[in-house]
């Protein structure tokens, strides 16, 4: 065992190549310069080393910078970056949007490990807010990033950012998140033109407050019932019979399909039955 | 693989209280927003709470005092404490995981309240 612990004659290693594939891990350990390795961390990724191997690499950095390693070496950590736990993560200071992308890509296309879920919230917390380069980063790799913060996370979401949010980022937001993103997107978009507008807010209107659902009725938007049944209900109560048919336009029909269903139920319950019997839909309240 | 099995539910009289779990495996929940919403026949699915991972919940109006979500991180399990029930609480309940890759959605369990 003794002798094991220094390097073989001939062996020391002057760069990170193939060769090392075929050191045992006491070798690696031996022949491998820990500042070699942290210089040239880019090559590690093109060469096949094995899991076991990975673990001598990760061991040596950890001694070089046992306060968390530089950025320098975090942007180029590839496949190691998968045996880092989050108590290593949490020693970083990750400041480059380029680095949390490269350690995204090694993950991607799988469930959000404890490590990435650490690395985003350091990264975030670094920056003090969900910028929209950010926020565009993490939804492209996880489009269901802003549904799984709570709603004092996405406080921190500054207006701006919302131009990065698409549809289908917010699909599985619940009722107290679009509460909090609706009046960030009206603002936001707030100097839209009103079908422009419209288009832009739909995704947030489950966030929506009945004065802001009554200004939309008078702009002509043909909100479509997809996007009416998923309205706060106690936004829809309020409403108008005039209102909801202003609202809904050609889509009014629509109504008698989903009569039985929050909100379109409540709401008729909440009309006068000469009101509902305007629309000609045999709606019964 | 990831799977989401509710239990707890059953059948109780107005007034009564049931606690309903929701144990998640194969993942960290922890890293997810943990729900419950109920569909009673007929009715669209609804919206009934939240436990946000920072610890924080929310509630639907039409439970607000009644009911309260809690989890245990470390036994990847949320629950549903449902007191004072109406018979107006009757549906199927799921437990819901918004994780930021997917969301994920349990079997369900079913609740009635019989006055």
């Known amino acids: 065992e003794v002798e094991k612990t220094a390097c073989p004659s001939g062996k020391k290693a002057r760069e990170i190549d193939e060769s090392l594939i075929f050191y045992k891990k006491w070798e690696l350990e031996a022949c491998v310069d820990a500042a070699l390795l942290a210089t040239q961390m880019d090559r590690v990724n093109a060469i096949p080393f094995t899991y076991e191997q990975l673990d001598v690499l990760k061991h040596k950095l950890d001694e070089l910078y046992p306060q968390g390693y530089p950025e320098s070496v975090i942007q180029h950590l590839g496949y190691l970056f998968l045996k880092m736990s989050p108590e290593d993560i949490r020693k970083w200071n990750v400041t480059s949007l380029e680095t949390l992308k490269a350690l995204l890509e090694v993950n991607k296309g799988h469930e959000m490990s404890p490590q990435v879920a650490t690395l985003i919230d350091r990264f975030v917390k670094g920056r003090g807010q969900l910028d929209k380069d950010t926020l565009d980063t993490l939804t492209a790799f996880y489009p269901g990033y802003l549904c799984s913060l709570s709603p004092e996370e996405l406080s921190s979401v500054p207006p701006s950012s919302i131009w990065a949010v698409r549809p289908q980022d917010l699909d599985t937001c619940d009722p107290r998140q679009l509460d909090v993103l609706y009046p960030k997107a009206r603002l936001a978009f707030q100097n839209m033109n009103g079908s422009e507008y419209f288009v832009k807010i739909q995704s947030f209107l489950g966030g929506a407050p009945t004065e802001d659902l009554k200004a939309l009725s008078q702009q002509n938007v043909s909100m479509d019932l997809a996007t009416f049944m998923k309205l706060r209900t106690d936004a829809v109560l309020p409403l108008t019979v005039a209102e909801v048919q202003k609202l809904l336009g050609p889509h009014v029909e629509g109504l008698k399909a989903e009569e039985r269903h929050r909100p379109v139920r409540d709401w008729i319950l909440r009309q006068r039955q000469d009101d509902l019997d305007t629309l000609g839909l045999g709606l019964q309240g | 693989q990831v799977h989401l099995v509710e239990s707890g539910g059953g059948s109780v009289q107005v007034g009564g209280s049931l606690r309903l779990s929701c144990a998640a495996s194969?993942?960290?929940?922890?890293?997810?927003?943990m729900s419950w919403y109920r569909q009673a026949p007929g009715t669209e699915r609804e919206f009934v709470s939240s436990?946000?991972?920072?610890?924080?919940?929310s509630y639907a109006d039409s439970v607000k005092g009644r009911f309260t979500t809690s989890r245990d991180s470390a036994k990847n399990t949320v629950f549903l404490q449902m007191n004072s029930l109406k018979p107006s609480d009757t549906a199927m309940y799921y437990c819901?995981?918004?994780?930021?890759?997917?969301?994920?959605w349990g079997q369900g369990t079913q609740v009635t309240v019989s006055s």
């Open positions: 819901n995981a918004a994780c930021p890759w997917r969301a994920y």
């Open positions: 194969g993942y960290n929940a922890s890293i997810c927003r």
């Open positions: 436990s946000y991972r920072d610890g924080s919940q």
